[in-house]
């Protein structure tokens, strides 16, 4: 039969962050191609990269749909050069993905601090919200857009001049924080979810940004 | 489930170190930060500082910075708080607490330092 | 720093009272509050988080409320096991400060 000598896909991962969403398997074709699959729990399959000969498949356009449902993808494998038969009753080996659900397990990607201003003794520190593939009325939602209040970030902040750091929390995109007049500080930002409790609650720390340098302002 | 177990009380000189162990188990412990706490006998509670096990990050009041020193172990998912220099004011128990960053969510039992020459 | 003042410091009350306790922030914190319980010889037990919400499996009768600089927990019936030591505390900038505490004892 046209399936004998493919191999069902294996190891298929979800790779996932600000909802840019790919799925990968095992192994590298040899001879064969595949199409992947995706659903939510109840809804019907839909076919994407169609006999492709990569170990990759972009899902993001199917799950920003709506990233609170589960999705369960599948591999199948088909010969290559394998043509679309009307007449083929035979199924091609495939694999079933993880069950994946985008709000709660998409990765958080490295945040960047847009800027900072000091005026006086304090300093308002914004985080830069990142957009995503995610819609709503034909608009692209922002980062913060898609998780409200559930998406906070964690600031740190230190004096140039030494190595002891504070912290402060927001729950916007923003911190007002206190600091010493006539300081120079430093600022890295991490994002959280404080309502996951997988291993994907926190994001990478923003590369640091301190004053003195091109992001920031300064009024007396 | 989640737990944070902590070492056995301990006594010490004044001027002497100690080191206080908090392993913790049934999470991910990279994922959340660990908080130390210190209530000294009939009193409340004070924030000492602490660790991001996922960047090595440490925080600490103002009080305690060169008197505690925060570190983790990834590979055993345990923290650990160094108390220097002791003296009888550092007579204590000490918590570790998982910190879920809006509250402390579990604790561990508690280390009592006693500082006594 | 950001001071926590907790009041009062010691309560007396009986059990099926409606008893609350406050916390004043210095400086505005939003919502970043979280409430604690201690028995004598234990460790602290979260009750509520983010100034309103009901820690897991902590019973119905414990509500927080509040924003900015003025926060309030309420026992709205007061049960036997509920006689404990509260504390408040800060998590929205370091140092994390804890309200003095407030002993809750049985009338």
């Known amino acids: 039969s046209g399936t004998t000598n493919t191999v069902a896909a294996y190891n298929l991962t979800w790779k996932s962050t600000n909802f840019k969403t790919i799925l990968e398997w095992e192994p590298k074709p040899i001879n064969q191609v595949y199409t992947v699959q995706i659903s939510t729990k109840s809804g019907d399959w839909k076919s994407k990269c169609f006999y492709t000969a990569d170990t990759e498949c972009d899902l993001t356009d199917e799950i920003v749909k709506d990233v609170k449902q589960t999705y369960l993808a599948r591999v199948f494998s088909y010969p290559a050069g394998h043509v679309e038969s009307t007449g083929s009753t035979e199924e091609p080996p495939y694999e079933n993905s993880p069950e994946f659900t985008p709000y709660l397990e998409t990765n958080l990607g490295q945040p960047t601090i847009q800027s900072f201003e000091q005026v006086g003794t304090k300093v308002n520190v914004t985080v830069q919200d990142e957009w995503t593939l995610v819609r709503r009325n034909d608009t692209f939602l922002s980062l913060r857009d898609v998780f409200g209040k559930d998406l906070i970030y964690t600031l740190y902040y230190w004096k140039s001049s030494s190595s002891g750091k504070k912290t402060a929390k927001t729950n916007t995109n923003e911190f007002l924080i206190d600091v010493d007049k006539g300081e120079n500080y430093c600022f890295s930002v991490q994002a959280v979810i404080p309502s996951r409790r997988t291993a994907n609650r926190k994001s990478t720390d923003s590369p640091v940004e301190c004053m003195g340098h091109e992001k920031g302002e300064s009024r007396e | 489930q989640i737990q944070l177990v902590q070492s056995g009380g301990e006594v010490k000189k004044p001027g002497a170190s100690v080191r206080v162990s908090c392993k913790a188990s049934?999470?991910?412990?990279?994922?959340?930060?660990v908080y130390w706490v210190r209530q000294s006998p009939g009193k409340g509670l004070e924030w000492i500082g602490y660790?991001?096990?996922?960047?090595?990050?440490?925080i600490y009041d103002q009080n305690f910075k060169g008197k505690a020193t925060l570190t983790v172990d990834k590979s055993t998912s345990t923290a650990y708080m160094e108390l220097s220099s002791l003296r009888s004011e550092d007579t204590a128990v000490y918590f570790c607490?998982?910190?879920?960053?809006?509250?402390?969510?579990?604790w561990g039992q508690g280390t009592t330092v006693t500082v006594s020459s | 720093d950001i001071q926590m003042t907790q009041s009062p410091a010691s309560l007396s009350a009986s059990v099926g009272d409606r008893v609350t306790i406050t916390c004043l922030a210095s400086?505005?914190?939003?919502?970043?509050l979280a409430w604690y319980l201690q028995k004598p010889g234990k460790s602290p037990q979260l009750l509520i988080y983010?100034?309103?919400n009901l820690a897991d499996g902590v019973p119905s009768r414990f509500s927080g409320s509040g924003s900015g600089t003025d926060f309030s927990f309420t026992i709205s019936s007061l049960q036997p096991e509920d006689f404990a030591t509260y504390y408040c505390?800060?998590?929205?900038?370091?140092?994390?400060?804890f309200g003095q505490g407030t002993k809750l004892e049985i009338k």
């Open positions: 400086q505005t914190i939003d919502t970043w």
């Open positions: 049934g999470y991910s412990f990279t994922d959340y930060n």
């Open positions: 607490a998982r910190d879920v960053t809006t509250a402390l969510d579990f």
């Open positions: 505390q800060q998590v929205y900038s370091s140092p994390f400060t």
């Open positions: 660790i991001d096990p996922y960047n090595g990050i440490t």
């Open positions: 983010a100034a309103t």
